[in-house]
């Protein structure tokens, strides 16, 4: 008996071939001997089966002795043994129809779980193997689960169902809803304008939700809300904004905020959350602001940084084109009685300069 695997919703063509290469009488029946379709001369006739409106054949092939049964919009319950009667012969084809669906929305928040459920006909014992867009393989039976979805899991999942040494392939598009970056850091000199951008890692035609930016300044004992906003069809509207700092927010995606100037009291870290309509959970992006200030007070030249810096960052003070006078893994460095010239304060990571501030020291007479 020939075995054919089909996919729920698809179309399948079951073949039946006569030895004579001409149009002769044929019938297709199911295992209950109920006629599905056949011919009367050059006319297609249909029986009382439940496939009536979904069954068809290819009349153009009859003259070549081919009498296929075409079943459209396959259902799991179409799984059956189909019998083609032609030239006093019976050809049996076993059709097994499978369906594979994500049992939740295919748009999932980062960190959520994806469960794929296999619908299969009674009596079948299929195995399923799925390959994620980042090349990870998972195997299972009737259900497959992937916990803690990551951004790289966005894309087409290819799942292969194996039964009786035959296989059928499913493709499921999964969208992981997340910001492009989990965290970002902005380095600014005191007084410079600050821009924070929160690009999303997905695109949808209509995006609706609400969000908030909470800020924990390094100098403050507790965090405070800086801005709340709504998102409607990709348009951002500010609901409430703090008066210090004087924030501005762009009205279109990607989410974008500007501070008129970087000040030590704003240095710290923020958490932007975005709750999307009809989704449980929120998207998060952390943003950090590091502010540098170089000052000269009487005979003391000081360079300071505020905000979340890693312990391996180096803070240096150097006279232009000369060796660093002082370099420390600390948040403040100073030089007493600095010589005249253009001094540079540098914040660097393994030799790469992240932030630089220049200060001119005038000669003392």
């Amino acid at each position: 008996k020939k075995v054919v695997l089909g996919k729920k919703g698809d179309t399948v063509e079951l073949t039946c071939t006569a030895s004579q290469k001409k149009s002769i009488q044929f019938h297709w029946k199911n295992s209950n001997q109920i006629k599905i379709l056949g011919n009367q001369g050059s006319f297609l006739t249909k029986g009382p089966s439940k496939l009536n409106d979904r069954a068809d054949s290819r009349r153009s092939l009859w003259d070549q002795g081919n009498f296929p049964l075409i079943i459209k919009n396959l259902k799991i319950e179409d799984s059956d043994t189909y019998i083609c009667e032609v030239e006093d012969q019976k050809e049996e084809v076993q059709l097994l129809v499978f369906g594979l669906t994500a049992n939740s929305d295919t748009h999932l928040l980062q960190g959520q779980s994806l469960t794929l459920t296999l619908e299969s006909p009674p009596g079948s014992s299929p195995s399923v193997q799925c390959r994620s867009p980042r090349g990870k393989n998972i195997q299972g039976g009737k259900t497959l689960s992937v916990s803690q979805l990551e951004l790289q899991d966005s894309g087409t999942w290819t799942c292969t169902v194996l039964q009786n040494q035959k296989k059928v392939e499913f493709k499921i598009d999964i969208v992981v809803l997340a910001f492009q970056k989990a965290s970002s850091i902005v380095y600014k000199k005191e007084g410079e304008q600050v821009e924070f951008s929160f690009p999303l890692a997905f695109t949808v035609e209509k995006l609706t939700g609400s969000g908030e930016l909470w800020w924990q300044a390094e100098r403050a004992s507790s965090s405070k809300s800086w801005i709340t906003f709504d998102l409607k069809n990709k348009e951002v509207s500010v609901k409430w904004v703090t008066q210090d700092p004087k924030l501005q927010m762009g009205k279109k995606l990607p989410l974008h905020l500007t501070l008129p100037q970087a000040l030590p009291q704003y240095a710290g870290s923020g958490n932007l959350t975005l709750a999307l309509e009809a989704k449980t959970g929120k998207l998060h992006q952390e943003v950090n602001l590091v502010v540098m200030r170089a000052t000269q007070l009487q005979k003391n030249l000081t360079c300071e940084v505020w905000g979340p810096t890693s312990p391996k960052l180096m803070l240096s003070l150097k006279l232009e084109n000369k060796e660093a006078k002082v370099s420390k893994r600390e948040k403040a460095v100073w030089v007493l009685n600095p010589e005249a010239g253009m001094w540079q304060c540098l914040l660097s990571d393994s030799g790469q300069v992240l932030l630089e501030s220049n200060i001119k020291v005038l000669p003392t007479w």
């Epitope: 304008q193 600050v194 821009e195 709504d230 409607k232 069809n233 348009e235 509207s237 500010v238 501005q248 927010m249 762009g250 009205k251 279109k252 974008h256 500007t258 008129p260």
Partner: antibody, heavy 119, light 107 residues
């Protein structure tokens, strides 16, 4: 082709009211954000008010906040500007403008309607 | 509200000249800035959107650029029909704000 046609301008006394209309043709009104922009005689352009495509969010310049109200009627493809407590400094040509779908810029403008506030 | 400072307020030039007009934003506004041309008695017309994108149907002698919060409109070779008033408009956030305008006159 998208066209915008303003109407409702005229002469009104200080403290009076006026309602401007902007009839749109050739577009699905609810898809686009719309704005009112004015120009006082011999002066530059001043953005007055805006409304989101859905009509849910409205925005105003500080100079008209609390006195002007922007609304839209999607079934009539018409944008309105209700102007109350009018002042002499509201005298201007009022333009309505449509924004692009993916961009905020004003790609289509009406010809304008003149509002004169004088006693 | 975001302030837009446009300069110069007026400019005299000749046909064939290269002309630049600048706008400075008081806040970072990404590329969310457009340039508009207005002729007497007419409605404004968009030339450049998103700081540097040329609106369909606008001659290629018009171009826009951005450096931080400074935006520039350049007309590479003035034509007689270019004598008009030019405005920048920040459409980054509400309330939108225009620059004060630059009147371009024939020398």
């Amino acid at each position: 082709e998208v066209e915008l046609l303003e109407s409702g301008g005229g002469l009104v006394q200080p403290g009076g009211s006026l309602r401007l209309s902007c009839a749109a043709s050739g577009l699905t009104f609810s898809t686009f954000a719309m704005s009112w922009v004015r120009q006082a005689p011999g002066k530059g352009l001043e953005w007055v008010s805006g409304i989101s495509g859905s009509g849910e969010n409205t925005y105003y310049a500080d100079s008209v906040k609390g006195r002007f109200t922007i609304t839209s009627d999607n079934s009539k493809n018409t944008l309105y500007l209700q102007m109350n407590s009018l002042r002499a400094e509201d005298t201007a040509v009022y333009y309505c403008a449509k924004e692009g779908y993916n961009w905020n810029y004003m790609d289509v403008w009406g010809k304008g309607t003149t509002v004169t506030v004088s006693s | 509200a975001i302030q837009m400072t446009q300069s110069p307020s007026s400019l005299s030039a000749s046909v064939g000249d290269r002309v630049t007009i600048t706008c400075r934003a008081s806040h970072g506004i990404r590329n969310d800035l457009g340039w508009y041309q207005q002729k007497p008695g007419k409605a404004p017309k968009v030339l450049i959107y998103e700081a540097s994108s040329l609106q369909s149907g606008v001659p290629s002698r018009f171009s826009g650029s951005r450096s931080g919060t400074d935006f520039t409109l350049t007309i590479s070779s003035l034509q007689p029909e270019d004598f008009a008033t030019y405005y920048c408009l920040q459409d980054y956030t509400y309330p939108y704000t225009f620059g004060q305008g630059t009147k371009l006159e024939i020398k």
